[in-house]
C-alpha cells in the first residue's frame, strides 16, 4: 500500500504520500483555529507507472497507454485514497467549540 | 461540473475532461477486442485552482496552501470523477463474447 | 482458478543469463496483457518489461538491450530472457497477467552475486 508506513520509509520516486506541514496561521492566513497551531496535512505525488496502485480500470489503460506512447500527454495522477479526520478547537466569541473536521490527513495515495 | 457538456464546449485552462481516441491495436497493442476498434476514454488535466471542484476538504486546503504558497510542489490534482462503462465483442476461439468493462470511460473531472 | 507459476530464478554471477517462465492456466491468455515486475528489499514493484496480445514490447530503461519478453500462446506462457546481469537486477521477480483485471504471480527470487 502506498501508504505513510511505506512512503515515509522509503526514497520512492513513484506516487506515495508525502509529508507536508501546515502552520494554520503562516501557510493558510487562519487565525481562527486555536489548536492545534497546525498540522501534518501531506501530500499525494508522484508518477504512476502501468498498474501502481490503479484505481480503476480506465487508470489502468491510461497507465498501458502512456508506457506504450511515452510521448502522451494523458497519464494517471496520484492522489489521495484514505483521509482522516482532524480535531481542532476555536472560539465563537469566549465560547470553546471543539470540531472534527473530516478529510484532513491524508494516509495514502493512488493513481486515478 | 467540470463534465464533458461543459469542457469539450470551451477552451478550459483548468482541469477540465479532455477528448482522448484510444485506438486498441494501434496505441496498446490490444488485438482481443473485436469492436469497437477503438474508443474514447478520455482523461482530466489542467491546474487546481483554490475551490475548483474541491473533493474533500483536504483537497480545498491543499488549494488554499497553494494558492498563498506558489513556491510549493504540493497541490490538488485534477482526476476522473464519474465514469462510464464501455461495452465491447470479443472472441473465445469462435465463440463471440459481449462483455461491459465498467470505468472505462471519463465523463466528469475533480480536484483530488 | 487463475494461477501463475514463475519458475527459473536463482543464484548467478555477474554478467550471467538466466530465463524466467511463467505459466498460466485459468485465463484466456492469448488476449492477456503479460508483464514481468521485480521488487527488491524496501521497493515498490517495479514494471521490468511487458508484451501485449499484439506483441508491443516496452522495457524499463535500466534493462533495455540486455532482458527479452517473449510469449509462447500454444504453451501459455510468457519468458523473460536476462543477459549481462548486475548486482542491481536482484530482486523477487513477479509474473502479471492484466486481463479485465490484474492478476499475480508468487513470485521467483533472481539473486546476482559474485
Known amino acids: 500500500a502506498l501508504d505513510t508506513n511505506y512512503c515515509f520509509r522509503n526514497l520512492e520516486e513513484n506516487c506515495c504520500v508525502r509529508p507536508l506541514y501546515i502552520d494554520f496561521r503562516q501557510d493558510l492566513g487562519w487565525k481562527w483555529v486555536h489548536e492545534p497551531k497546525g498540522y501534518y496535512a501531506n501530500f499525494c505525488s508522484g508518477p504512476c507507472p502501468y498498474l501502481r496502485s490503479a484505481d480503476t480500470t480506465h487508470s489502468t489503460v491510461l497507465g498501458l497507454y502512456n508506457t506504450l506512447n511515452p510521448e502522451a500527454s494523458a497519464s494517471p495522477c496520484c492522489v489521495p485514497q484514505d483521509l482522516e479526520p482532524l480535531t481542532i478547537l476555536y472560539y465563537v466569541g469566549r465560547t470553546p467549540k471543539v470540531e472534527q473536521l473530516s478529510n484532513m490527513v491524508v494516509k495514502s495515495c493512488k493513481c486515478s | 461540473a467540470l463534465d464533458t457538456n461543459y469542457c469539450f464546449r470551451n477552451l478550459e485552462e483548468n482541469c477540465c475532461v479532455r477528448p482522448l481516441y484510444i485506438d486498441f491495436r494501434q496505441d496498446l497493442g490490444w488485438k482481443w477486442v473485436h469492436e469497437p476498434k477503438g474508443y474514447y476514454a478520455n482523461f482530466c488535466s489542467g491546474p487546481c485552482p483554490y475551490l475548483r471542484s474541491a473533493d474533500t476538504t483536504h483537497s480545498t486546503v491543499l488549494g488554499l496552501y497553494n494558492t498563498l504558497n506558489p513556491e510549493a510542489s504540493a497541490s490538488p490534482c485534477c482526476v476522473p470523477q464519474d465514469l462510464e462503462p464501455l461495452t465491447i465483442l470479443y472472441y473465445v476461439g469462435r465463440t463471440p463474447k459481449v462483455e461491459q468493462l465498467s470505468n472505462m470511460v471519463v465523463k466528469s473531472c475533480k480536484c483530488s | 482458478q487463475l494461477q501463475l507459476v514463475e519458475s527459473g530464478g536463482g543464484l548467478v554471477q555477474p554478467g550471467e543469463s538466466l530465463r524466467l517462465s511463467c505459466a498460466a492456466s485459468g485465463i484466456i491468455f492469448s488476449a492477456s496483457t503479460m508483464a514481468w515486475f521485480r521488487q527488491a528489499p524496501g521497493k515498490q514493484r517495479e514494471l521490468v518489461a511487458l508484451?501485449?496480445?499484439?506483441?508491443?514490447?516496452n522495457y524499463a530503461d535500466s534493462v533495455k538491450g540486455r532482458f527479452t519478453i517473449s510469449r509462447d500462446n500454444a504453451e501459455n506462457t510468457v519468458y523473460l530472457q536476462m543477459t549481462e546481469l548486475k548486482f542491481e537486477d536482484t530482486a523477487v521477480y513477479y509474473c502479471n497477467a492484466f486481463w479485465l483485471k490484474a492478476y499475480w504471480g508468487q513470485g521467483t527470487q533472481v539473486t546476482v552475486s559474485s
Open positions: 508484451i501485449t496480445d499484439g506483441d508491443r514490447t
